[in-house]
């Protein structure tokens, strides 16, 4: 399930079987003490602050071409909202979005704490080059986190970090169709820490979901549900404080 190339490689085209010009900064930044790229809070980048500190602002670890970087677009977690506030990257030289959606900014949950479990509507389903970003903090003594990309009652992609499964930390991915769970795919690399903030990014590609946590590539999961346009809801649950959930096209 996991692959051995960095997300920087995958997204910049190097070593990627389907290079499509993803932003090169995703996944190649060193993680700081706080689990975000570059440094711990506060001040990962000039003018930045922890998630939710300033409504309308880009999330920590934003990078050119990432959510919040489009001119005049609301930052992740603002739906709809004002342009990106101080701390968002300048908009010059950004790639324009391509594909089914216009190059609009991220849409999703309002900024600030969200009630978990939380459902993020994906009105047109998911499409390749769609980037879903979830910001939050793992609760102390957490047991589980779950993301469920849903097609009606089916779960197209279940992403389930488990903090204590037989005294081990593991990420389980699966699909549930017609109330039947399929074959589990397990990943032992575990980037989540109880009590610490996190950023999960899910990039939809033609053949798989690609997942990065704290700007480091984690895993990919081949599509088992082919009708991506029918995956119209993302359920977010588990032992987290959720700051924002949003999506954009890259």
């Amino acid at each position: 399930m996991a692959d051995n190339f960095s997300l920087h490689d995958a997204l910049s085209g190097s070593g990627n079987p389907n290079p499509q010009g993803w932003p090169g900064a995703w996944g190649n930044q060193p993680a700081g003490a706080g689990g975000y790229p570059g440094a711990s809070y506060p001040g990962a980048y000039p003018g930045q602050a922890p998630p939710g500190a300033y409504p309308g602002q880009a999330p920590p670890g934003a990078y050119p071409g990432a959510p919040g970087a489009y001119p005049g677009a609301p930052a992740p977690g603002v739906y709809p909202g004002p342009p990106s506030g101080p701390g968002a990257y300048p908009s010059s030289g950004q790639p324009s979005a391509t594909g089914a959606y216009p190059a609009t900014g991220p849409y999703g949950a309002p900024a600030g704490p969200l009630i978990v479990p939380y459902n993020l509507p994906l009105p047109g389903g998911v499409v390749p080059r769609m980037l879903i970003t979830i910001l939050g903090t793992v609760k102390p003594n957490a047991n589980r986190i779950a993301l469920d990309f849903q097609r009606g009652n089916d779960v197209a992609f279940h992403f389930n970090p488990r903090f204590n499964e037989n005294n081990r930390r593991v990420i389980v991915c699966n699909t549930k169709l017609d109330n039947n769970w399929g074959r589990e795919e397990r990943q032992s690399v575990f980037p989540f820490e109880s009590g610490k903030p996190f950023k999960i990014q899910v990039l939809v590609e033609p053949d798989h979901f690609k997942v990065a946590v704290n700007d480091a590539h984690l895993l990919q999961y081949n599509h088992r549900v082919k009708k991506l346009n029918e995956i119209s809801k993302l359920g977010i649950s588990g032992d987290i404080d959720l700051t924002s959930a949003s999506y954009t096209m890259i």
Epitope: D178, N180, W181, G182, R183, R224, V225, K226, K227, N229
Partner: antibody, heavy 120, light 107 residues
Framework: EVQLQQSGPELVKPGASVKISCKAS????????MHWVKQSHGKSLEWIGY????????GYNQKFKSKATLTVDNSSSTVYMELRSLTSEDSAVYYC?????????????WGQGTLVTVSA | EIVLTQSPASLSVTTGEKVTIRCITS??????MNWYQQKPGEPPKLLIS???TLRPGVPSRFSSSGYGTDFVFTIENTLSEDVADYYC?????????FGAGTKLELK
Amino acid sequence: EVQLQQSGPELVKPGASVKISCKASGNTFTDHNMHWVKQSHGKSLEWIGYIYPYNGGTGYNQKFKSKATLTVDNSSSTVYMELRSLTSEDSAVYYCARGEYDYLAWFAYWGQGTLVTVSA
Amino acid sequence: EIVLTQSPASLSVTTGEKVTIRCITSIDIDDDMNWYQQKPGEPPKLLISEGNTLRPGVPSRFSSSGYGTDFVFTIENTLSEDVADYYCLQSDNKPLTFGAGTKLELK
């Protein structure tokens, strides 16, 4: 190459039951749904339901829920369909067909069909 | 359930002629339509799957188009080996349903 080999023709009496089989070879058996389709003589096709061999999960056309039961034996890569309380309306050719993992998908591979004749 | 209305029920053509078969669905199914060919004594054969996708090994004279509720299956330059029954199948929702079929004959 995927192959689906079905059991031979059956002649059964009204009110009885019959169990027909479909043995798969040539690919990962457990990871694809196996569907059953009915074709009455000179008529169109009707989807009966499917079974997911990995865990035995099933999905049925409501019309056939009280008529058909689907089971699987993973050790022999074989799926079965039992038809009960047979009447002349159940006389048909029954096909197994391999679908994709997603039960909402097409069937690319079919068995040769099993003719079931219900007659006194 | 989704009802598929397939037409015509039968048609007779000469070799080299173009054949058009239509399938109309009772509700919108996006592009989740599939087309099968069935010859006497044989199981159906998948020609075209969802998204108007020609299956590997199927001659390019077969094609389909459509989205939503209206779908068309076409054979360009019909050959004698194309004599068969043709069925549409929707894979958008359970229960999966087929059209009533079209019997293609040669004059």
